[in-house]
């Protein structure tokens, strides 16, 4: 018995060869004996059956004359997985046709984190194993179910599951969309004053995107954390429902998702995260947002430089005055120096070398009062 | 442990509908094959239907086709049959069953493994 | 549809003894085969699959053998607890079918 693998939706090609590798009277039917198609003598195709019954079944006209005789199954179904007898030349040739599916579970748009189920279907009788590639090269073995937990970012893509029965091999392509944030954390560095643009960009592009979110923010001197907006999304469009006072936020009207705080003050450094729930999704998307802020200040003979803020224990602080060895540098939130000379001088937010932040501040002559440019 | 319970049996007058239902406790069940299988009174096993474990791939035995329906629900880790325009012929023990895999060098082997105590089924008028 | 007959359709045996029980298909079922035990008011228990395989906590008196048309059940030293009906099964092909039964008596 022949064994012919096909794809649900696809089409199978069944095949019958003649010894004489000439045109010859044939017929398939299906097991029960009931006829599909074949020809009588005449070069002309006879159907079993009515045209809407038997429409997905056909021959290779053009293959008759060098004695084959296939019969093509098309838009197969998976009810089409039975035997099928091909009838000529006084014998009878059995072929096995099984049909395959790889379905990913209930949706190919998956949150990361959540967990991505390929499920084989396959025909009662049917012995496969399946073998899934990730985008990222990652394999996963397996029988009719095969489950990947904690999906990540770089699992957005085409996988590549390969079903294996009976040495034949059927391929299948799925496309998984992994919905995330581009980026899980994100740090945003700003001297006192100065203007904070908030990004939270997407992963991911679909048609139409609806759904609710919030940020809520911790700052670091405060004792619990605050909604500071809450907002709507409807079709890509993004429109506020509620915005705290105090900072005053604005936010964009279209994707990316974007805020703006009117300025960075040490009340508001701190950190906060943006959870947006997609319409028909279960679970969130979070993203983490971090504002550092640097205050420089001049109060009498002393010289101050503090940062407020989530920094990590490795930054530096430095004073230094401008083109020369930074005058003190300590892995603390706020260094000074007293009775600082004349100039201008630099406050340093720095990791491994690489400035983050910088402020200047001019100190004046002992008569003036300082200037902070 | 692994258990299967069916429920749903009784008796039924020809013509007329059941709906039986098969429990699942002690294993991931949205992974799994399921399959009803039945047995009229002293007599032999014989398959019904078949289901896929996404509950997209349905076989039939011919005497039920177009009269039963397989079903299953992963949420509630329950599969269902729904038995319409019943026959006499139809009364019998209804067992549930699941359908395990053995892995031997990158080749799967399935055969049923795990079956229920089965629901009883009358038809009778 | 592939039938499956097994033979015999009863087979009274001594407790210790060796009882042997065959099925054959009526076309190759390669070796995608189980045997099943049932007792009297109880579920079906699988032995044997993929004609040789012993299932999880079956004792190992129980061995399966054949391939294609013709298999074997051996049951090496039969204890009390063996006397029931056994009924073999194929899984090659929908619809998947089962053999009549052969019932194992204590002589």
């Known amino acids: 018995k022949t064994l012919v693998l096909g794809k649900e939706g696809e089409s199978a090609e069944l095949p019958c060869e003649s010894s004489q590798k000439k045109i010859t009277v044939f017929t398939w039917k299906f097991s029960d004996q009931r006829k599909i198609l074949g020809q009588h003598g005449k070069g002309v195709l006879i159907r079993g059956g009515s045209p809407s019954q038997f429409d997905r079944f056909d021959s290779k006209k053009g293959a008759w004359e060098k004695g084959s005789f296939p019969l093509i199954i098309n838009k197969l179904k998976m009810e089409d997985s039975q035997t099928y007898i091909c009838e000529l030349e006084n014998r009878k040739e059995e072929v096995e046709l099984w049909v395959f599916k790889v379905t990913a579970n209930s949706d190919t748009h998956l949150l990361q984190g959540q967990s991505l189920t390929l499920t084989l279907e396959s025909p009662p009788g049917s012995s496969p194993s399946v073998q899934c590639r990730s985008p990222r090269g990652k394999n996963i073995q397996g029988g009719k179910t095969l489950s990947v937990s904690q999906l990540e970012l770089q699992d957005s893509g085409t996988w590549t599951c390969t079903v294996l029965q009976n040495q034949k091999k059927v391929e299948f392509k799925i496309d998984i969309v992994v919905l995330a944030f581009q980026k899980a954390s994100s740090i945003v560095y700003k001297k006192e004053g100065e203007q904070v643009e908030f990004s939270f960009p997407l992963a991911f592009t679909v048609e139409k995107l609806t759904g609710s979110g919030e940020l809520w923010w911790q700052a670091e001197r405060a004792s619990s954390s605050k909604s500071w907006i809450t907002f709507d999304l409807k079709n890509k469009e993004v429109s506020v429902k509620r915005v705290t006072q105090d900072p005053k936020l604005q936010m964009g009207k279209k994707l990316p998702l974007h805020l703006t705080l009117p300025q960075a003050l040490p009340q508001y450094a701190g950190s906060g995260n943006l959870t947006l729930a997609l319409e028909a999704k279960t679970g969130k998307l979070h993203q983490e947002v971090n504002l550092v802020v640097m205050r420089a200040t001049q109060l009498q003979k002393n010289l101050t430089c503090e940062v407020w803020g989530p920094t990590s224990p490795k930054l530096m602080l430095s004073l230094k005055l401008e083109n020369k060895e930074a005058k003190v540098s300590k892995r603390e939130k706020a260094v000074w120096v007293l009775n600082p000379e004349a100039g201008m001088w630099q406050c340093l937010l720095s990791d491994s070398g690489q400035v983050l932040l910088e402020s200047n501040i001019k100190v004046l002559p002992t008569w003036s009062t300082p200037v902070q440019p | 442990q692994v258990q299967l319970v069916e429920s749903g049996g009784g008796l039924v007058k020809p013509g007329g509908s059941l709906r039986l239902s098969c429990s699942a406790s002690g294993f991931t069940f949205s992974d799994y094959y399921m399959n009803w299988i039945r047995q009229a009174p002293g007599k032999g096993l014989e398959w019904v239907s078949y289901?896929?474990?996404?509950?997209?791939?349905?076989f039939y035995t011919d005497s039920v086709k177009g009269r039963f329906t397989i079903s299953r629900d992963n949420a509630k880790n329950s599969l269902y049959l729904q038995m319409n325009s019943l026959r006499a012929e139809d009364t019998a023990v209804y067992y549930c069953?699941?359908?395990?895999?053995?892995?031997?060098?990158?080749?799967?082997?399935?055969?049923?493994?795990?079956w229920g105590k089965g629901t009883t089924v009358t038809v009778s008028s | 549809e592939i039938v499956m007959t097994q033979s015999p359709a009863a087979l009274s045996v001594s407790p210790g003894e060796r009882a042997t029980l065959s099925c054959r298909a009526s076309?190759?079922?390669?070796?995608?085969f189980a045997w099943y035990q049932q007792k009297p008011g109880q579920a079906p228990r699988l032995l044997i699959y993929n004609a040789s395989t012993r299932a999880t906590s079956i004792p190992a008196r129980f061995s399966g053998s054949g391939s294609g048309t013709e298999f074997t059940l051996t049951i090496s030293s039969l204890q009390s607890e063996d006397f029931a009906v056994y009924y073999c099964q194929h899984y090659n092909n929908w619809p998947y079918t089962f053999g009549q039964g052969t019932k194992l008596e204590i002589k």
């Open positions: 069953a699941r359908e395990d895999y053995s892995n031997y060098e990158d080749h799967y082997y399935y055969y049923t493994g795990v």
């Open positions: 076309q190759s079922v390669s070796n995608k």
């Open positions: 289901i896929s474990s996404s509950g997209i791939t349905i």
